[in-house]
């Protein structure tokens, strides 16, 4: 009987084992098939080429006061995606802007050498020949061209010949329009902020990025011009000259833009000095925009060396005059306001000088000199109200020059001396020029970099010239790289676990089954 009983229990055990093994086998088989299919599906739909093919691009920003070279890189397979291009290098060319080389064009080649050699080092040699180089000149060269087209053309010709000597794919040097400068700045910041992306994100990695797709306006301040660009609420414009239409990533944008030539911070200062010296009783100009105790001699010939001061030009009974700082924000502000003609407006609303400006809409990124100046003054925080900024400016401007020099020993005196004027000018331009208010001030975000890339027109310029901003939403890979990696790892783990369980089941002794029954 005992033997029969043992046999029956063995049969039972065998039946259970067969039944379990069949079920487990089915489950394991099904799981591994699902995992393999998922791996193939994710891998094939993502179609990510490895190793990644990296492309580079170079843009030179030939500004009025200096030239900067920017190097950008991006994965070749993703060049139509949003936010994939990022800056890897910025090289500031030693010396003034290229327009200052008009009487010494033969020196331009040497001037550009250091930064072009730096680009040669940063970009892998194998990529040199396919790396495009663009040079865009802005308001400094626009002003030179107003004086003489030939002079501006000669400078650009020497620049082109110099840049053609490098192993890169030189695509030309040109003076970009004020409209382009504004538009490309707007494209840059919205591209970097992810505003053109139609994908919903699991998390945000950009500090200013919001869940909505409302674009940011762009406020750009240079040495010789300033630009304002944004999407107004009302899509019909009173001034076609200030209207731009874009179709980017499948969406239409009606953009307002204007560039105010001569209203960059350096040219605005020359304008203010030329205006104020008209009423000076002698060769001393007591100036509220400079710190008390500050003194500087200015040549009258230098004052009138720009088309921006022509409207104030007059014969003065002296060749030189001395600026003597008195450091009074309120008086400086008043003096600056006289640069903005607000008495004439042929539209429903104007900025200044009879230029149409629609009502401000949304958030604004203020970059370039807006950021540099406000950052120096420690006023870029989102928490600082307009009233606080004004208070800080009053305090800063009234500080004696000797004290300022001691406090900021590492800063070049030429730049240091002008922060009081520049800060006051920025406030005047934003509040009285563009009609920001104490309330709307909180919508201005002073931005230096976004995800490591400088805010400015250069990135937008390159994206446009390399056709990396499609009009329609591209048929992009359906998953972000991080999601793709996560799913690949997950399904690989499922396969590994299935394999381990399978091995355990089919290579374990019979007591494994006893324990299970």
């Amino acid at each position: 009987m005992k033997g029969t009983k043992d046999l029956t229990s063995q049969q039972k055990e065998s039946n259970v084992k067969t039944f379990c093994s069949k079920n487990i086998l089915a489950i394991l088989g099904f799981s591994s098939i699902i995992a393999v299919i998922a791996l193939l599906a994710v891998g094939l739909t993502q179609n990510k080429a490895l190793p990644e093919n990296i492309k580079y691009g170079i843009v030179l920003d030939a500004g009025s006061s200096h030239t900067s070279l920017y190097i950008y890189k991006w994965p070749a397979e993703k060049e139509n995606d949003t936010g994939v291009v990022h800056q890897v290098e910025e090289c500031r060319v030693k010396g003034p802007g290229i327009s200052k080389y008009v009487q010494k064009v033969n020196e331009i080649g040497i001037y550009l050498t250091d930064c072009m050699e730096r680009a040669r080092e940063v970009i892998p040699r194998s990529q040199h020949q396919e790396t495009p180089v663009y040079l865009g000149a802005t308001a400094g060269m626009r002003l030179l061209r107003m004086e003489s087209e030939e002079l501006a053309d000669r400078v650009l010709d020497v620049v082109e010949r110099s840049l053609s000597n490098y192993p890169f794919d030189f695509q030309g040097a040109r003076i970009i329009t004020g409209q382009e400068e504004g538009a490309y700045g707007w494209i840059t910041i919205n591209y970097l902020l992810g505003k053109f992306s139609q994908k919903t994100r699991w998390f945000s990695i950009v500090p200013y990025e919001t869940n909505n797709q409302e674009t940011f306006g762009a406020l750009d301040l240079g040495g010789a011009s300033t630009q304002i660009t944004f999407v107004p609420q009302n899509q019909t414009t009173e001034s076609p000259d200030n209207a731009l239409q874009f179709r980017l990533y499948g969406k239409d944008y009606n953009v307002y833009t204007h560039s105010f030539l001569c209203y960059g911070k350096d040219q605005a200062l020359w304008q203010k000095l030329a205006k104020d010296i008209q009423v000076a009783s002698n060769e001393i100009l007591r100036d509220p925009c400079f710190h008390p105790g500050y003194k500087k001699v200015v040549n009258v010939s230098d004052l009138y060396k720009t088309p921006c001061t022509k409207r104030f030009e007059m014969t003065l009974p002296f060749q030189q005059f001395e600026i003597q700082g008195i450091g009074n924000y309120q008086q400086c502000h008043q003096s600056v306001l006289e640069l903005f003609n607000t008495s004439y407006c042929p539209y429903s609303q104007c900025a200044f000088n009879g230029i149409f400006l629609p009502p401000l809409q949304g958030d604004f990124g203020a970059f370039s000199a807006f950021y540099f100046v406000m950052n120096f003054l420690n006023l870029t925080s989102e928490k600082v109200s307009q009233e606080k900024v004004t208070e800080m400016m009053k305090k800063f401007c009234s500080q004696p020059w000797e004290e300022i020099k001691t406090s900021y020993a590492g800063v070049k005196e030429k730049y240091l001396s002008e922060y009081c004027f520049s800060g006051t000018y920025i406030l005047s331009l934003l509040l009285q020029g563009y009609h920001f208010t104490a309330d709307s001030w909180e919508h201005i975000h002073f931005i230096g970099k976004i995800q490591g890339s400088d805010a400015g027109w250069t990135l937008g310029y390159m994206l446009n010239l390399t056709n990396m901003i499609p009009a329609e939403q591209p048929l992009s890979t359906p998953l972000s790289h991080s999601t793709y990696v996560f799913l690949m790892v997950l399904f690989s783990l499922v396969l590994v676990i299935v394999a381990i369980i399978g091995l355990l089941i089919f290579h374990k002794p019979s007591y494994f089954w006893k324990d299970m029954v």
């Epitope: 327009s99 008009v102 009487q103 030179l144 061209r145 107003m146 004086e147 003489s148 087209e149 030939e150 002079l151 501006a152 053309d153 000669r154 010939s301 009138y304 060396k305 720009t306 088309p307 022509k310 030009e313």
Partner: antibody, heavy 123, light 106 residues
Framework: EVQLVESGGGLVQPGRSLRLSCAAS????????MNWVRQAPGKGLEWVSS????????SYADTVKGRFTISRDNAKNSLYLQMNSLRAEDTALYYC????????????????WGQGTMVTVSS | DTVLTQSPASLAVSPGQRATITCRAS??????MHWYQQKPGQPPKLLIY???NLASGVPARFSGSGSGTDFTLTINPVEADDTANYYC????????FGQGTKLEIK
């Protein structure tokens, strides 16, 4: 009507100096570059010197560099040419000429000319 | 200096015919070539600027063409009043003039 009137020419001995003036009217003087161009008797035209509208660019022909100085007084709508160390080969009719414009941009061609003032350098 | 060579040095054309004057630059001057007419005892008068643009008040009988190094001034048809010296001038580098072409009407 645009008018350019030169003065200051005359007979001068070699090595001496002379100052030519050009009085401009009929246009916004400080918006235009100005020039001196000369023409020796029976010969062709020779550019002497340029002064751009905002004094960004001042230049001279090699034949006069270091001896002649161009200047302008925008408030007086006047252009000047200070000529030092004069030579016999500087003998010519000296024209004051205005730079032209390509639309909104300045151009280094000459759209209006004065009648000229004669400079004779002889001992 | 950019040297400008005009040809011919002189030419005689009958009224109603076409007169063609050429100007060759020793180096490329883009389109920065200009043409002047000078009658005896008068200052030069601008005819053409930037290779092909007619100066204000100049009859459409005058036309200019060319770019780089080779430029042409054409007068078609020629009139008796066109007797004068004609000069080309480049402005790509510091200004230089051609040596002049004397046009006579037969």
């Amino acid at each position: 009507e645009v008018q350019l009137v030169e003065s200051g020419g005359g007979l001068v001995q070699p090595g001496r100096s002379l100052r030519l003036s050009c009085a401009a009217s009929g246009f916004t003087f400080n918006n235009y570059g100005m020039n001196w161009v000369r023409q020796a008797p029976g010969k062709g035209l020779e550019w002497v010197s340029s002064f751009s509208s905002s004094s960004t660019y001042i230049s001279y022909a090699d034949t006069v560099k270091g001896r002649f100085t161009i200047s302008r007084d925008n408030a007086k709508n006047s252009l000047y040419l200070q000529m030092n160390s004069l030579r016999a080969e500087d003998t010519a009719l000296y024209y004051c000429a205005r730079h032209g414009r390509y639309g909104g941009y300045g151009g280094f061609y000459f759209d209006y000319w004065g009648q000229g003032t004669m400079v004779t350098v002889s001992s | 200096d950019t040297v400008l060579t005009q040809s011919p040095a002189s030419l005689a054309v009958s009224p109603g015919q076409r007169a063609t004057i050429t100007c060759r630059a020793s180096e490329g001057v883009k389109s920065y070539m200009h043409w002047y007419q000078q009658k005896p005892g008068q200052p030069p008068k601008l005819l053409i600027y930037k290779a092909s643009n007619l100066a204000s008040g100049v009859p459409a009988r005058f036309s200019g063409s060319g770019s780089g190094t080779d430029f042409t001034l054409t007068i078609n048809p020629v009139e008796a009043d066109d007797t004068a010296n004609y000069y080309c001038q480049q402005s790509w580098n510091d200004p230089t003039f051609g040596q002049g072409t004397k046009l006579e009407i037969k």
